[in-house]
């Protein structure tokens, strides 16, 4: 650690005195201190001498000696008071700039330590400090305003009591800057704009920040627009607004508009697209297939996307049949706006009943005309099966009718014993009917098929079962011949709760 001669923490001299401060270290040493004039600095081997032969109040301050080559960065310091009866203060700065909530040191150094008891801090022209100003004083460093606030940005003077009267320092301007968290906040409205040629349009670009030092501009396809700026201050934020008003838009006004704001922390930008069209438009589309198949009892949401300008004048969902003249309940229709020109309309169909299959149409209208989008809803049903014994062309035949959607496949099983359902161990024979006869196949209805199994002789200790299945489920009917005739066993009743 360097050593300073004289080896005292502080030195008090009179104006005009010669002051010599010597610093000695192991290696080269250097002096540093307030940038006060009239010092001469010279080196002498491993020592550095700071001297003046005419000390003034401006030389009051703390002088520090460091050894640049010392890895531990040791230093020594001495504080010099130049005790001028006419000048109680040496002010080291015209202005002090800090960020909010930092301590602000106002560097009025007392030139005479004896005066410490009578010091105070005031605002210029003798005005008292603002309420809640918390400050402390050090004769070596000056007044510290603790946790400075933006509102404390004022001009201050240091006051000392000399011979019963207050002597003021020159003023120090305190600038407390807001802490800027990042680039200015931006809004660009609207987020998207569509106009018909000849209509009026407005685009507003606004930026705000806690600090007034920021720039904002609006550009169209990379060309900066010259727009008058409106400035405002509210909610403790500075706001700058650029408003582009277009009385009659044309195709050259279309394109990308960017709102750009920047400050010392960086740049923010946001963009929007302006479309200019020749006439009104209305487009309907769906991400869903327009042909829908749903299992009976389940629910379905039909969704239509609408792109339109100008806005819709009317819209509704309509059931076009074929089962009844009921119309969808309005409470099941829902509209959500994705953005200004795109909307999604949803029709919720919960727990679908057989009578609700059919065509659903969404109709919408704007000045561009009417448009419709129609969905076809077919319900899926598990097969229902029945078997009867009959004679066809003199031959004994088992006739199986299966009804469901999609069209059921039919399989016949013959098994030993009397049973409601053949299991694998009992099966004697299996016949698949690849082409059952289609009895009915109307849109939105079940498909009914019929399969015939010609049986020359019914075996009385056996069961004949007709099984039908489709993608929804399966159904079966067991036929048990008995001596007195035939006996049929339908499966457990098919429970249906719509």
């Amino acid at each position: 650690i360097p050593v300073i001669e004289p080896s005292v923490p502080e030195l008090v001299v009179k104006p005009g005195a010669t002051v010599t401060l010597r610093c000695v270290g192991n290696g080269s040493v250097e002096w540093d201190g307030p940038p006060s004039p009239h010092w001469t600095l010279y080196s002498d081997g491993s020592s550095s001498i700071l001297s003046t032969n005419n000390a003034t109040f401006q030389n009051t301050g703390t002088y520090r000696c460091t050894e640049p080559g010392d890895p531990l960065g040791g230093s020594a310091a001495i504080h010099l008071y130049v005790k001028d009866p006419a000048r109680p203060w040496n002010v080291l700065a015209q202005e002090v700039v800090v960020f909010e909530d930092q301590d602000a040191l106002l560097p009025c150094l007392l030139t005479d330590p004896v005066l410490e008891a009578g010091v105070s801090l005031v605002r210029v022209r003798g005005r008292p400090l603002m309420r809640h100003t918390n400050y402390s004083f050090s004769p070596w460093h000056g007044f510290t305003i603790h946790r400075a606030k933006f509102i404390q940005s004022q001009d201050y003077q240091c006051s000392a009591l000399m011979g019963g009267r207050k002597v003021m320092s020159i003023s120090i301007r305190l600038k407390v800057q807001k802490v800027i968290p990042g680039p200015p906040a931006l809004t660009l409205v609207p987020a998207e704009l569509v106009r018909i040629r000849g209509e009026a349009a407005q685009i507003v670009c606004s930026a705000s920040s806690v600090d007034v030092n920021f720039d904002v501009f609006l550009q169209h396809n990379n060309t900066k627009l010259a727009i008058p700026q409106q400035s405002d201050f509210h909610n403790n934020r500075y706001q700058k607004v650029l408003t582009l008003n277009l009385d009659q838009v044309d195709f050259q006004h279309a394109g990308n508009y960017s709102c750009v704001a920047s400050n010392v922390q960086g740049k923010h930008s946001t963009s929007m697209f302006f479309r200019v069209v020749e006439s009104a438009y209305l487009n309907l589309s769906s991400e869903q297939n327009l042909i829908q198949e749903v299992t009976v009892g389940e629910g379905l949401n039909l969704k239509v996307m609408v792109e339109a300008y100008p806005g819709l004048q009317g819209f509704n969902w309509t059931y076009l049949g074929p089962f009844s003249d009921h119309q969808p309940e309005p409470k099941l229709a829902n509209a959500t706006t994705k953005d200004t020109y795109r909307h999604t309309f949803t029709l919720s169909l919960p727990r679908l009943k057989p009578s609700e299959a059919g065509r659903y149409s969404f109709l919408a209208r704007n000045p561009g005309g009417w448009r419709a989008l129609t969905f076809e809803l077919t319900l899926r049903y598990p097969p229902e099966v029945s078997v009867i014994w009959t004679f066809i062309n003199g031959s004994g035949t088992l006739l199986c009718a299966a009804s469901g959607y999609p069209q059921p496949n039919v399989t016949w099983l013959q098994c030993s014993g009397h049973t409601d359902r053949c299991d694998e161990a009992q099966v004697l024979q299996v016949w698949d009917d690849p082409y059952p006869e289609v009895l009915s196949q109307e849109p939105f209805h079940k498909v009914t098929v019929q399969s015939l199994l010609t049986v020359e002789t019914l075996e009385h200790n056996q069961t004949y079962e007709c099984r039908a299945h489709n993608s929804v489920g399966s159904g079966s009917w067991a036929f048990i011949p008995i001596s007195a005739g035939a006996h049929t066993h339908p499966p457990d009743e098919f429970l249906f709760t719509p």
Partner: antibody
């Protein structure tokens, strides 16, 4: 070795604010005075002002109304703002450490700022 | 117009001694010390002489400074081609309460 480094936009429009930052590597900025000095092309040096790490500033009287300096010790950097710039503010701007008044012992390499529309 | 006055140019041949003057007033050089800076082409200025006549470590002893009244001077002996640069003087000015520079002297080594 202490090494100051200036950064900021190279082009500023007339009437706007010039903002530069000086980041110091190789040593702490604390406890020292730091100055901004500029040099218009082909001419001499002009002292703009200085800032101490506590935020105390002294400015060249001819520029005082347009200059603000601030310091951020946590980032080991200080900054210069010069408002209402004109073409006459076009120059290479240097930041430097200042000792004992006018002894500028460490300089940045300088950054050219052009004021033009 | 600089507060401190320097000749715009100076020249010398290798090995020669050249002197650059810096003239001020009582409010600057008359009451404060003079510092000198060397600026090689395309680079930042570098401290050459401080406190009238002190050389920072690394500066050759061919460079020396002096002050008399309200003027300062920089002498370069044994001139070398690498000394070709701009040289600036600087001092504190009590009236302006700030640092003032000379206009600079362009030294050419012939």
């Amino acid at each position: 070795q202490v090494q100051p480094q200036e950064s900021g936009p190279g082009l500023v429009k007339p009437s706007e604010t010039l903002s530069l930052t000086c980041t110091v590597s190789g040593g702490s900025i604390s406890g020292y005075y730091w100055s901004w000095i500029r040099q218009p092309a082909g001419t001499g040096l002009e002292w703009i002002g200085r800032i101490y790490t506590s935020g105390s500033t002294n400015y060249n009287s001819s520029l005082k109304s347009r200059v603000t300096m601030s310091v951020d010790t946590s980032k080991n950097q200080f900054s210069l703002k010069l408002s209402s710039v004109t073409a006459a503010d076009t120059a290479v701007y240097y930041c430097a450490r200042e000792r004992m008044a006018t002894i500028f012992d460490y300089w940045g390499q300088g950054t050219l700022v052009t004021v033009s529309s | 117009q600089s507060v401190l006055t320097q000749p715009p140019s100076a020249s010398g041949t290798p090995g020669q001694r050249v002197t650059i003057s810096c003239s001020g007033s009582s409010s600057n050089i008359g009451s404060n010390t003079v510092n000198w800076y060397q600026q090689l082409p395309g680079t930042a200025p570098k401290l050459l002489i401080y406190s009238n006549n002190q050389r920072p470590s690394g500066v050759p002893d061919r460079f020396s400074g002096s002050k008399s009244g309200t003027s300062g001077s920089l002498a370069i002996s044994g001139l070398k081609s690498e000394d070709e640069a701009d040289y600036y003087c600087a001092a504190w000015d009590d009236s302006l309460n700030g640092v003032v520079f000379g206009g600079g002297t362009k030294l050419t080594v012939l």
